[in-house]
Structures are given as C-alpha cells and as structure tokens.
C-alpha cells in the first residue's frame, strides 16, 4: 500500500465541487502536455502527455525545500491548475562581506542553525553584531553589506598598558567598568565563581573588573553566551583550571595545562592527547568510554579528552589504586 | 637539539615480518608520547600508529590495526614498529616522530626504507 | 577519513615571486569548541618533513615570517611571500581535527 499510489478513488479536493468520475471522458489524444515547474524545482514523474484528473508532483533540488501545494492537477481544457508553490533555499550562501572581515567557518553553503562569526584583525572590532545564524534562507540578524570594522577602544585606551588597563601618566591603572566602558566593545560569555552563573558581559567591562581583582571571573568564549557544546566545555574547563599549574594569560583568556596560546588569535586552542608532557603531578584516575578498566593520566590528558568531547569518567584524583 | 634515528629497513617478503627500531636522544624520551608516520610511492603520508609515554595505551591506524604492534622501551629510549603479515601496500618510507606543544608531528627521524616484494 | 586537496600539485615559481597553495577538506576542521587542527610541513628533496604553520595560522620555531597561512571551515591557504630558493620541496597540509590524521597528495614548489 502506497499513500502516492492512485487506484481511481473518487477523491474531492478541498477546493473542488466535482470527484474525478464526474470529469468528462476525453480523446487519448488529448490531455495536458509537460507543465513549467518552479525555478530550482523540476518534476518528478516526468512524460511528455498526462491525462486528465492526473496529477504531476514538484520537487525541489537539493539545498531547496517546497513551499506551498505541490501538486499540479490536468484540467480538461489541456491546462494545469497549480497552486503557488515555489522551491525555497535551505541553506544560507556564505555572505559577501568587506575584505577586512574574516568569516569562521568559511564555507561556500551554509546548513539552516549554523552559526559564523565574523572577526577583524588585531586591534579592530566588528562595528555591529559578530555572530549570525543561517535561518530559512536568510541571515539573522540580516548582515549588512556596508559592515566594517572599527579601532577598537580598548586599544586605544590600553597604549602600551595590557588589556584591562589603561595609560596614567606614565604608569597603568585598572579601567572603571562604569566610566572608561560606555563604547561598544564586543561581547563575552563569561562564568562568576561566586554566583556560579553565567552572562554575557562587554570585553571591557570584563577586562576592567579581571583587573580590579575579580578573580572569579573566567571568560569562556567570545560572543554572547548560548547553550552548546562550546559553553557546556566552557564551564567544564572552568572547573579543572582549579588544579592547572599554568595559568598563561592570552587575550580575554588565560591558558591551563590542556592547551595552548594561538599568537595569531590570541585564544587558547587545546591541546590533542599525544600533545601532552608527561610532567606534572596533577593526576586523575579515570574509566574512558565504554572501558571498566581504570587508568591514571594527567590533567593535559584530562584537559584535551574532555575538550575533544570523548566519552571518560574522573573517578577521584590522584593515581588509581589498582 | 631532538635527535630520532631510525633503524635499517629492507626488502620483506609479502606475508612476511620486519621490526623497526627508532633510538631519541636530547631530550627526556619517557615524557612524550611518540609515533610512527609512513610515506608511501602512491598513497603519500599516512599516520600509522602512536604510542603514550610508559606503552599502556596505543592507537593504529585501521589498515594495520592486527598487524603491527607499536612498543617502547624507555630505559633504552628507543621506540618500535613490529611490522607482520606485510602486504606490497605497506612498501614506504617509515619516519618515527615526536610531537611538541605546536604540533602532534613535530619533530621526525630521517627515514628507513621498507619494501614489501616478492 | 577526511579528504584534504592540494591545489594546485606543481607549482613553478621565480626567487622572490609570492605564491599561494590551497588546501581544501572534504569536511569542516572546526571543531565544536572552535578548534581547527590544520598544520603546513615542507618537505625539502631527500629530507624529512618539517613543521612550518600549525593550528591554521601559527608559524612553527624557527621558520621564517615570509610564510603565513589562513582559512577556516573547509579552505585553508598558505602563502610564501618572496620564494627563496631554500623554499622549495613538496608542501603539505595536515589535519588533526578528525581521527585518523590525514595529510594532502602534495605541491610541488619548483623554479622556473
């Protein structure tokens, strides 16, 4: 049994006064010839004749999704009647941006709910929204063509200062959140220890109260802070930096034992499994994936499996006792 | 300065075994894992195995996974690739390797030939 | 496994001339923390791969400043600006992102 398949019932459509066997009888001759289907759509049982009460279906290439009946129906008169369908983009091309932009990923098509943030060189922020989402066919929010970037402030003020702070004379003072930070400056995801919660904070305004001594705050990752994989890592990596012996700043960031100071984009990048110093004396028994047996590894290791999201239990500190 | 020096290899029979040998030298062998890269005449360079710091954990690529064996000896700092059943596809040259903070391969042994013929 | 091409594989150049090599992959190298594992290596005639670029954009110890690469998702690029005869050799892309590591066929830098 096939829902498609056509056995002559005498259908009535929602719009139609009269059942199929009430059509007239026509010539074999005469019928409904090939009909136009939407553009980036074609037909799907294709013929040069069809007869009268048949219907053809439309479909869409891949990347297009019908929008609309996409049913065409033979009239007796030889025409179609068709109501408006159309065949609709899935996919959201990758956007024309100015030069200066970098667009991560880059992609030529991009899948509806992808994500791409748009960056700018060092010292330079993007003077609107950095992250788009693919929606429909569209970009949301929309990307402007005339999208720059702009002197980022926080340079400005920095001089020769590290972020955070700010030129006084000839020395450097913490910014204040409140008076040094009312331009725009890119948002964080950021975690407050105190209030174990999460928010999206101004780059300023984190920078000037990690300089004020705020050491409960921990930046997790550029752009406003939505649920993922990149926050759930995040907060998971927030709480093994409590036992890291290195605690390298980079950026916004600060690097633990697991990872890395990219100094082309001053982020952490982790560190893969096989990356790791034996050193250290930072260690962790833990059952990895499926296994039941136990083993011993090092906070690098621990660090870079959990941020390569591989399946592995921490069963308690220290070396395993078998 | 990280010195990996492999040992000989040569001509192997197809079906037939051969066990290669990496000596490391200037730096601290038992605080890195290590790993054998192979570049072939046609299939280019392929990663074949590694190995952590004391041997209690290994990992193959799937074309040699059962037939060779990855080991290590750390009191002699030298690493191993216990090649078997040797087909004419595994015929390449064998680097062993040492990565580092930058990168998983980033430091290589000159090379040994192997031939797999009959 | 992940497919990397190399574009173009020959590559003949002139000292001092800026060229570019193309590597693309068969799927996204970003990870779902925003990781991308992308290294360069040149290969000198007769000796063994040496590591140039790592994690997309980072120049490796020691190499010289006239090397850059860029990209993201599936296209990477590294540049040569000013071919120095020391330069040439076959260059290649690598991937860590997805098990097993993989590596491109190969550029063959050349003078002309």
């Known amino acids: 049994f096939s829902i498609m398949e056509n056995n002559g019932q005498p259908c009535i459509n929602d719009d139609e006064e009269m059942k199929e066997v009430d059509l007239p009888e026509i010539e074999a001759d005469s019928g409904c010839p090939q009909p136009v289907p939407p553009e980036n759509g074609f037909i799907r049982n294709e013929k040069q004749l069809y007869l009268v009460g048949e219907d053809v279906e439309i479909s869409c290439l891949t990347g297009f999704e019908t929008v609309g009946y996409q049913y065409f129906r033979c009239l007796p008169d030889g025409t179609w009647r068709q109501g408006d369908v159309e065949c609709q983009r899935t996919e959201c091309i990758k956007p024309v941006v100015q030069e200066v932009l970098t667009i991560t990923p880059f992609q030529r098509l991009y899948r509806i709910g992808e994500s791409i943030e748009l960056t700018c060189p060092k010292g330079f922020v993007v003077a609107g929204p950095s992250r788009y989402t693919c929606q429909g066919n569209s970009w949301t929010p929309p990307i402007s063509n005339s999208l720059t970037c702009e002197k980022d402030t926080l340079t400005k003020l920095k001089g020769h200062c590290q972020l955070g702070q700010k030129q006084s004379g000839s020395e450097c003072i913490c910014m204040s959140p409140e008076e040094d930070c009312s331009h725009h400056s890119e948002d964080l995801c950021v975690f407050d220890t105190d209030s174990n919660d999460y928010f999206t904070s101004p780059a300023c305004k984190f920078l000037a109260e990690k300089c004020l001594n705020n050491q409960q705050l921990h930046f997790l990752h550029i752009g406003s802070c939505q649920d993922g994989r990149q926050l759930e890592w995040g907060l998971e990596r927030t709480r093994l930096s409590s036992n890291s012996t290195k605690k390298e700043s980079c950026g916004y960031d600060t690097c633990y034992d697991w990872e890395k100071c990219s100094a082309s984009t001053s982020k952490c990048v982790c560190l893969l499994p096989p990356q790791c110093f034996k050193g250290g004396n930072q260690l962790y028994c833990v059952k990895m994936g499926s296994s039941t047996s136990e083993k011993t590894l090092n906070i690098c290791e621990v660090g870079t499996i959990r941020c390569a999201n591989r399946k592995m239990e921490i069963l308690h500190p220290g070396k395993c006792l078998a | 300065e990280v010195q990996l020096v492999e040992s000989d290899g040569g001509l192997v029979q197809p079906g037939g075994s051969l066990k290669l040998s990496c000596v490391a030298s200037?730096?601290?062998?038992?605080?890195?894992?290590m790993a054998w890269v192979r570049q072939g005449p046609t299939k280019g360079l392929e990663w074949v195995a590694t190995i952590n710091y004391d041997g209690s954990s290994t990992y193959y690529r799937e074309s040699v996974k059962g037939r060779f064996t990855i080991s290590r000896d750390n009191a002699k700092r030298t690493l191993y690739l216990q090649m078997d059943s040797l087909r004419s596809e595994d015929t390449a040259t064998y680097y062993c390797?040492?990565?580092?903070?930058?990168?998983?391969?980033?430091?290589w042994g000159h090379g040994t030939l192997v031939t797999v013929s009959s | 496994d992940v497919v990397l091409t190399q574009t173009p594989s020959t590559l003949s150049a002139t000292i001092g001339q800026s060229v570019s090599i193309s590597c693309r992959s068969s799927?996204?190298?970003?990870?779902?923390?925003?990781?991308?594992?992308l290294y360069w290596y040149l290969q000198r005639p007769g000796q063994s791969p040496q590591l140039l670029i790592y994690?997309?954009?980072d120049l490796g110890s020691g190499v010289p400043n006239r090397f850059s690469g860029s990209g993201s998702g599936t296209d990477f690029t590294l540049k040569i600006s000013g071919v120095e005869a020391e330069d040439l050799g076959i260059y290649y892309c690598m991937q860590a992102s997805h098990a097993p590591y993989t590596f491109g066929a190969g550029t063959n830098l050349e003078l002309k």
């Open positions: 390797s040492r990565p580092s903070t930058e990168a998983l391969f980033a430091y």
């Open positions: 799927q996204s190298l970003l990870n779902d923390v925003g990781n991308t594992y």
């Open positions: 994690l997309v954009s």
């Open positions: 200037g730096f601290s062998f038992s605080d890195y894992y």
